[in-house]
Interface confidence: low
């Protein structure tokens, strides 16, 4: 009775179970009676990352500099190349197929988390007592100036976009 299933790391050919090729190698010839499967190493620039019966290796991913990508880790015969974004950019999706500029936090919002190669800037509204008057991918909210500690008085209240304005103490009349 012909076989319909094989052990792990084997595959079925003409009712015969052949050993698969290991990661980093591709199939050249199926096994035949007493002759084992013939495999050959993937060429430079190619890979196979699983036990397989593939006739062709996969091309390594190309990290396209036009898209802001560069090689994070060179591929081997067993692993694909991994790409990451250039400084100042982050991936547009999980596969990191292209990159985009980090977002800026506008005035009134400060940077909660600085962007990385894989995640964008996270902004947070400045709470009472803090302000941000710039669009930035780096600046956190700054605390309002304390007029009192400078021996001054508050002339104008601060907002989430502006600092307090301090002025001199009014002179007391005799």
């Amino acid at each position: 009775e012909p076989r319909t299933a094989c052990r792990e790391k084997q595959y079925l050919v003409d009712s015969q179970c052949c050993n698969m090729c290991p990661p980093g190698e591709k199939l050249v010839n199926d096994c035949l009676h007493t002759i084992d499967t013939e495999c050959t190493r993937c060429q430079t620039g190619e890979f196979l990352d699983t036990w397989n019966a593939e006739r062709h290796c996969h091309q390594h991913k190309y990290c396209d500099p036009n898209l802001g990508l560069h090689v994070e880790k060179e591929g081997t015969s067993e692993t694909d190349t991994t790409c990451t974004c250039d400084e100042g950019l982050h991936c547009t999706n999980a596969a990191c197929e292209s990159c985009t500029m980090h977002s800026l936090c506008p005035p009134g919002l400060g940077v909660k988390q600085i962007a990385t190669g894989i995640s964008d800037t996270i902004c947070d509204p400045c709470p009472i007592g803090f302000f941000s008057n710039v669009s930035s991918a780096l600046e956190k909210c700054h605390p309002w100036t304390s007029c009192e500690t400078k021996g001054l008085v508050k002339v104008q209240a601060g907002t989430n976009k502006t600092d307090v304005i301090c002025g001199p103490q009014p002179r007391l009349r005799a």
């Epitope: 396209d64 036009n66 898209l67 560069h70 250039d86 400084e87 991918a137």
Partner: antibody, heavy 120, light 107 residues
Framework: QVQLQQSGPELVQPGASVKISCRAS????????IHWVKQRPGQGLEWIGW????????KYNEKFRGKATLTADTSSSTAYTQVSSLTSEDSAVYFC?????????????WGQGTSVTVSS | DILLTQSPAILSVSPGERVSFSCRAS??????IHWYQQRTNGSPRLLIK???ESISGIPSRFSGSGSGTDFTLSINSVESEDIADYYC?????????FGGGTKLEIK
């Protein structure tokens, strides 16, 4: 307009170190790479490395790792390269140049160069 | 490291002639090549980026072509002010590398 203004020429003793500055103006300093390039007298251009002032991250040509140290001060929009343990091989003109964060964009603005002469 | 080979080392032409500079990469780099002009005692100046993209403010007589491993910078009508060294540079992978340069002389 975009400008990169480098510090003046330096005459330094062998074994000493030198710190060259590159002051940027006319653009957002934290959003572009600053690259450093070396040119020995009568020779071609050699890439030393880059710094991204927005993060402080650096990338060095292995040939210059331990020889050059790249830093940046965002408050003054100035990038620096310090070249240490100077020998006659370090006598050269050092250029800073700006590059967009997209990988394939070139070094579009260059400083005027700083001449370093190593001599006793 | 990617090796960039420029040829010839010296080019000598008459004003008005068309001239071509060659840059060959040791491996395929797509269009990640840029061309610079450096006059005597001056800083490099960007002429062409990404193999063929023109740069604002650079005369239209400068053009670039090529992809993969073979690249060319052309000046379609040489002027005396074009006397300079010309360098190609790749930004496909680190370390960035420059070609050895070609010196343009006027006959």
């Amino acid at each position: 307009q975009v400008q990169l203004q480098q510090s003046g020429p330096e005459l330094v003793q062998p074994g000493a170190s030198v710190k060259i500055s590159c002051r940027a103006s006319g653009y957002s300093f934290t959003s572009y790479y600053i690259h450093w390039v070396k040119q020995r007298p009568g020779q071609g251009l050699e890439w030393i490395g880059w710094i991204f002032p927005g993060s402080g991250n650096t990338k060095y040509n292995e040939k210059f790792r331990g020889k050059a140290t790249l830093t940046a001060d965002t408050s003054s929009s100035t990038a620096y390269t310090q070249v240490s343990s100077l020998t006659s091989e370090d006598s050269a003109v050092y250029f800073c140049a700006r590059k967009s964060p997209y990988g394939n964009y070139a070094m579009d603005y260059w400083g005027q160069g700083t001449s370093v002469t190593v001599s006793s | 490291d990617i090796l960039l080979t420029q040829s010839p080392a010296i080019l000598s032409v008459s004003p008005g002639e068309r001239v071509s500079f060659s840059c060959r990469a040791s491996q395929s780099i797509g269009t990640s090549i840029h061309w610079y002009q450096q006059r005597t005692n001056g800083s490099p100046r960007l002429l062409i980026k990404s193999a063929s993209e023109s740069i604002s403010g650079i005369p239209s007589r400068f053009s670039g072509s090529g992809s993969g491993t073979d690249f060319t910078l052309s000046i379609n009508s040489v002027e005396s002010e074009d006397i300079a060294d010309y360098y190609c540079q790749q930004s496909n992978s680190w370390p960035y590398t420059f070609g050895g340069g070609t010196k343009l002389e006027i006959k």
